[in-house]
């Protein structure tokens, strides 16, 4: 990464260094240390203070974005004296060259697309590269298949999400022969970016007085159980006047997903379709194929 690290320190320096790959801030251990503390301050003056590592000469920042530029700071007291050192971590490169409008979505339970746009001041020869790191194993995933626009990478397709965890760090680096390109980084929750498939195996069975709709929960990337789903059923009478309201029914997920409703014979032609969402987020899937029941002469 082409980011300058500038140190602001008194004469006897702690030699503070930051590894953006591991998000680890470290410094030279001092003899007879009685107190040590590390933190960062971002451009909005928010302070993040992680736990110190056991050796007390390093700390790891778990969930931070760096593209707006941050300042790291280390305070160490020994039995003899106190040390303080700042480390500026700017996003070097020309302003406006970083990838922008970055977004990702998971679909079909095991595929992910990420897209971005080239920075407005990026030169013609700019090339972007996406790296993803999960929160648990700190494993780095490099984009396996880039989506291109006139030779420039403007997206990424992943068909193997096994390296992801519930929260992941996305980094888009840029290169150019002409000028330095700024980076863009983002933290994304898989549960917030997943688009569910509609429910499957939708069936309707009717007797003389009622109709029973059954369906199966969609397969998802996230590990969800049946109570984690919310469903909406659209029961629609065919050949009604335009502007007639559809009946939208909310149904909580259950071990056996079913909805029983009164509908007596003779029964006009109806259609039913279903969509699904995570009960906590209500990011609705597309509708399932409409299933028809009843008859035209009902």
């Amino acid at each position: 990464e082409k980011s300058d690290l500038r140190t602001v320190a008194p004469a006897s320096s702690l030699n503070v260094r930051f590894d953006s790959r591991t998000m680890n801030l470290s410094w030279d251990c001092q003899e007879n240390t009685t107190f040590s503390k590390c933190f960062l301050t971002d451009k909005k003056n928010r302070v993040v203070e992680p736990r110190l590592s056991n050796n007390e000469c390093s700390c790891t920042f778990r969930e931070i974005c760096l593209h707006e530029g941050v300042t790291f700071e280390v305070h160490v007291n020994t039995s003899q004296r106190g040390f303080q050192q700042k480390l500026l971590y700017p996003n070097s490169g020309r302003e406006g060259t970083a990838a922008q409008n970055f977004s990702c979505f998971i679909y079909n339970a095991d595929l992910m697309n990420c897209t971005w746009a080239r920075g407005p001041t990026a030169p013609r020869d700019v090339q972007y590269f996406l790296y993803i790191r999960n929160s648990k194993r700190r494993r780095e995933i490099r984009c396996p298949y880039y989506i291109q626009d006139s030779g420039t990478h403007v997206g990424c397709h992943l068909d193997n999400l096994s390296g992801l965890t519930s929260r992941n760090y996305f980094l888009v680096n840029g290169t150019s022969r002409e000028i330095g390109i700024q980076f863009f980084d983002s933290l994304l929750d898989t549960k917030k970016i997943e688009r569910f498939n509609p429910p499957s195996n939708v069936t309707v069975r009717c007797n003389t007085t009622h109709c029973l709709v059954r369906w199966k929960q969609p397969r998802t990337y996230q590990k969800l159980s049946y109570l984690d789903f919310q469903y909406q059923l659209d029961v629609h009478r065919k050949n009604t006047q335009p502007g007639t309201e559809n009946l939208l029914i909310n149904v909580s997920g259950d071990l056996e997903n079913r909805y029983n409703f009164p509908s007596s014979e003779p029964r006009a032609k109806h259609s039913v379709k279903i969509r699904a969402a995570d009960v906590r987020i209500l990011n609705w899937s597309s509708w399932s194929e409409a299933i028809e029941f009843g008859s035209d002469d009902g």
């Epitope: 969800l224 159980s225 049946y226 109570l227 984690d228 071990l255 056996e256 009960v279 906590r280």
Partner: antibody
Framework: QVQLVQSGAEVKKPGASVKVSCKIS????????IHWVRQTPTKGFEWMGG????????VYAQRFQGRVTMTEDTSIDTAYLTLSSLRSDDTAVYYC?????????????WGKGTMVTVSS | QAVLTQPSSVSGAPGQRVTISCTGS?????????VSWYQQLPGTAPKLLIY???KRPSGVPDRFSASKSGTSASLAITGLQADDEADYYC???????????FGGGTKVTVL
């Protein structure tokens, strides 16, 4: 309707092992996450372990590690709990349950419980 | 000692409203992990009353409601009935210990 039918009460001597079964009817065990929880008058409810889909394996509470084994026979839709090196404070009602939500882990269906008494 | 703290008992007259508190810490309820509530009638297995902090499974009457704020949660029973007399337990997940944790239980008595 889903039901969890547990094996009958057991009386065991300290140091022995006990195996409790939990038969699922009305649904396929392979599609479910089964967990085991025990209840004592003194300690209340204690979670022992169960299938974690995130790890894709059965995980155990640290305090039972090494003494507890949870297995599943999906061909007969039955889950098993084996607890070894029994002590008197293992006297409890042991429940199997189905996880209805993985967000915070909510146990939706429960077996009726199996009373295990450890006494010399 | 239960990880989540509940009052040992609460009581109310029929028709009244009672609330049960459940206090945790920053590694469970405040982490934030979802809270579930269970009702246990004497001699029976627990029954899920609330999941996802405030959602009721089908079949649970809307007299039961719950909420969560910070490191604590609460369950409210309105229009108290004789058959609400039972033990009530809260439950969540604790990231520090990596285990599912329960409250010590609250006995609800209908006067």
């Amino acid at each position: 309707q889903v039901q969890l039918v547990q094996s009958g009460a057991e009386v065991k001597k300290p140091g022995a092992s006990v195996k409790v079964s939990c038969k699922i009817s009305g649904h396929s065990l392979s599609e479910l996450s089964i967990h085991w929880v025990r209840q004592t008058p003194t300690k209340g409810f204690e979670w022992m372990g169960g299938f974690d889909p995130e790890e894709n394996e059965i995980v155990y509470a640290q305090r039972f590690q090494g003494r507890v084994t949870m297995t599943e026979d999906t061909s007969i839709d039955t889950a098993y709990l084996t607890l070894s090196s029994l002590r008197s404070d293992d006297t409890a009602v042991y429940y199997c349950s189905i996880v209805g939500s993985f967000s915070g882990w909510a146990f939706d269906y429960w077996g009726k419980g199996t009373m295990v008494t450890v006494s010399s | 000692q239960a990880v989540l703290t509940q009052p040992s008992s609460v009581s109310g007259a029929p028709g009244q409203r009672v609330t049960i508190s459940c206090t945790g810490s920053g590694s469970n309820i405040g982490a934030p992990y979802d809270v579930s509530w269970y009702q246990q009638l004497p001699g029976t297995a627990p029954k899920l009353l609330i999941y996802h902090n405030n959602k009721r499974p089908s079949g649970v009457p809307d007299r039961f409601s719950a909420s969560k704020s910070g490191t604590s949660a609460s369950l409210a029973i309105t229009g108290l009935q004789a058959d609400d007399e039972a033990d009530y337990y809260c439950q969540s997940y604790d990231s520090r210990t990596g285990i599912i944790v329960f409250g010590g239980g609250t006995k609800v008595t209908v006067l």
